[in-house]
C-alpha cells in the first residue's frame, strides 16, 4: 500500500512543480513523501496542513474525525483544513527547509512513522 501511495505522491509532486513553476533551484520547500503522507511543494513562509492519512483509520477504528479527501486538485483543498480540527498535522516551509511535523503524527494521529514502515 505504501509503495503505491509513495508512487502516487511523487507523480502529484511532479505535476505540482510544473503548475507552480518549481525546479531544483527554486527557493522554497520541495514536495515530499515522508513515509506517512504526501506534502505539496511550498514557498518559504507557507504553512502546509494535511489530515491524518485515511489508511490509519483501519489501524485506529476509534478515530472519528472527518479526514480531508483528495478532490480534483492533487493535494485536495488544504485551505479547508484548520489546525483547530483534530487529526491535522502541519509543517512550515522555512529558509532551512521543512520544519518537523506539528503535532507529531503519534500525538495527532495515534501512529508512528515506524508503523508505516512495516
Amino acid at each position: 500500500i505504501f509503495k503505491k501511495e509513495q508512487a502516487m505522491c511523487l507523480e502529484k509532486i511532479q505535476r505540482a512543480n510544473e503548475l507552480m513553476g518549481f525546479n531544483d533551484s527554486s527557493p522554497g520547500c520541495p514536495g515530499m513523501w515522508d513515509n506517512i503522507t504526501c506534502w505539496k511543494p511550498a514557498h518559504v513562509g507557507e504553512m502546509v496542513l494535511v489530515s491524518c492519512p485515511e489508511l490509519f483509520r483501519i489501524f485506529n477504528p476509534d478515530q472519528v474525525w472527518e479526514t480531508e479527501t483528495i478532490g480534483e486538485s492533487d493535494f485536495g483543498d488544504s485551505n479547508s483544513l484548520d489546525l483547530s480540527d483534530m487529526g491535522v498535522v502541519s509543517r512550515n516551509c522555512t529558509e532551512d527547509g521543512w520544519s518537523e511535523p506539528f503535532p507529531h503524527y503519534f500525538d495527532a494521529c495515534g501512529f508512528d512513522e515506524y508503523e508505516s514502515e512495516t
Epitope: D62, W65, L83, M86, V88, D107, G110, F111, E117
Partner: antibody, heavy 123, light 107 residues
Framework: QVQLQQSGPGLVKPSQTLSLTCAIS??????????WNWIRQSPSRGLEWLGR?????????HYAVSVKSRITINPDTSKSQFSLQLNSVTPEDTAVYYC?????????????WGQGTLVTVSS | DIQMTQSPSSLSASVGDRITITCRAS??????LNWYQQKPGKAPKLLIY???SLQSGIPSRFSGSGSGTDFTLTINSLQPEDFATYFC?????????FGPGTKVDIK
C-alpha cells in the same frame, strides 16, 4: 481488567537515583496500541507528566524537557513491566509517582493508573 | 510547553447543584483535552476524553465541551461521591501538561 502495580523505595537520598517499577497485568508492555507513562504529583508542581515508552516495531521514549537529562524509562518484556529511573535527585523531586497506561481513541489519554508511590528525597 | 489554567481553584457546592469548571490552554489544542477526577490518597480517574466524550462507566451527569483554548467540565446534579479535585490535561503535544486542579467541596 488492566491493573498496574507499583513498587520501589519510598525514601531516596539527595544525589542518588530514584528507581520505581510498574508491573502490568491484563495488558502487555509490548502492546502496539498502548503507551506506558510516568507522572508525578507534588503540592508545589501539581501533576507533572514525566515521560512514556511504547513499542511500534521498535521501542521509543518521549521525556519531559524538565527531567530529560536525568530520566530513563525502560520496558522489561520478560516481566511485562516498565521502570522509572531518575538520577541526581534533590528534595524538589519529592512527590507521589504514578505509572499509567496511555490509550488512543481520537487522542491519547491515561485510562489506567498505578496506586501511586510517595517518594521522599531526604538525607 | 503548553500551559493549562483552571478556574475556579476551589468551589463549594451542595448535593443536587449543577457546577461548571473551566480550563484554558495557552495555545489552541483543538479538542485534545481530557478531564480527570482525583480523590484524596487515590490516583486520578479519567472522566472525559477528546473534550466531550464520556469514558466508559462514567455517569452521564458528567459532560465536557469546548475546542481550541477554552473548555468546560459540567456536573449536573452533584452527588456526594463527586466531591473531589478535577484536573484537565492536554495531549496535543508533549509534555502533556495538566491544569492545577479545581477542588469541589461541600457547602
Amino acid at each position: 481488567q488492566v491493573q498496574l502495580q507499583q513498587s520501589g523505595p519510598g525514601l531516596v537520598k539527595p544525589s542518588q537515583t530514584l528507581s520505581l517499577t510498574c508491573a502490568i497485568s491484563g495488558d502487555s508492555v509490548s502492546s502496539n496500541s498502548a503507551t506506558w507513562n510516568w507522572i508525578r504529583q507534588s503540592p508545589s508542581r501539581g501533576l507533572e507528566w514525566l515521560g512514556r515508552t511504547y513499542y511500534r516495531s521498535k521501542w521509543s521514549n518521549h521525556y519531559a524537557v524538565s527531567v530529560k537529562s536525568r530520566i530513563t524509562i525502560n520496558p522489561d518484556t520478560s516481566k511485562s513491566q516498565f521502570s522509572l529511573q531518575l538520577n541526581s535527585v534533590t528534595p524538589e523531586d519529592t512527590a507521589v509517582y504514578y505509572c499509567a497506561r496511555g490509550t488512543w481513541k481520537q487522542l491519547w489519554f491515561l485510562d489506567h493508573w498505578g496506586q501511586g508511590t510517595l517518594v521522599t528525597v531526604s538525607s | 510547553d503548553i500551559q493549562m489554567t483552571q478556574s475556579p481553584s476551589s468551589l463549594s457546592a451542595s448535593v443536587g447543584d449543577r457546577i461548571t469548571i473551566t480550563c484554558r490552554a495557552s495555545q489552541s489544542i483543538s479538542r485534545y483535552l481530557n478531564w480527570y477526577q482525583q480523590k484524596p490518597g487515590k490516583a486520578p480517574k479519567l472522566l472525559i476524553y477528546a473534550a466531550s466524550s464520556l469514558q466508559s462507566g462514567i455517569p452521564s451527569r458528567f459532560s465536557g465541551s469546548g475546542s481550541g483554548t477554552d473548555f468546560t467540565l459540567t456536573i449536573n446534579s452533584l452527588q456526594p461521591e463527586d466531591f473531589a479535585t478535577y484536573f484537565c490535561q492536554q495531549s496535543y503535544s508533549p509534555p502533556f501538561t495538566f491544569g492545577p486542579g479545581t477542588k469541589v467541596d461541600i457547602k
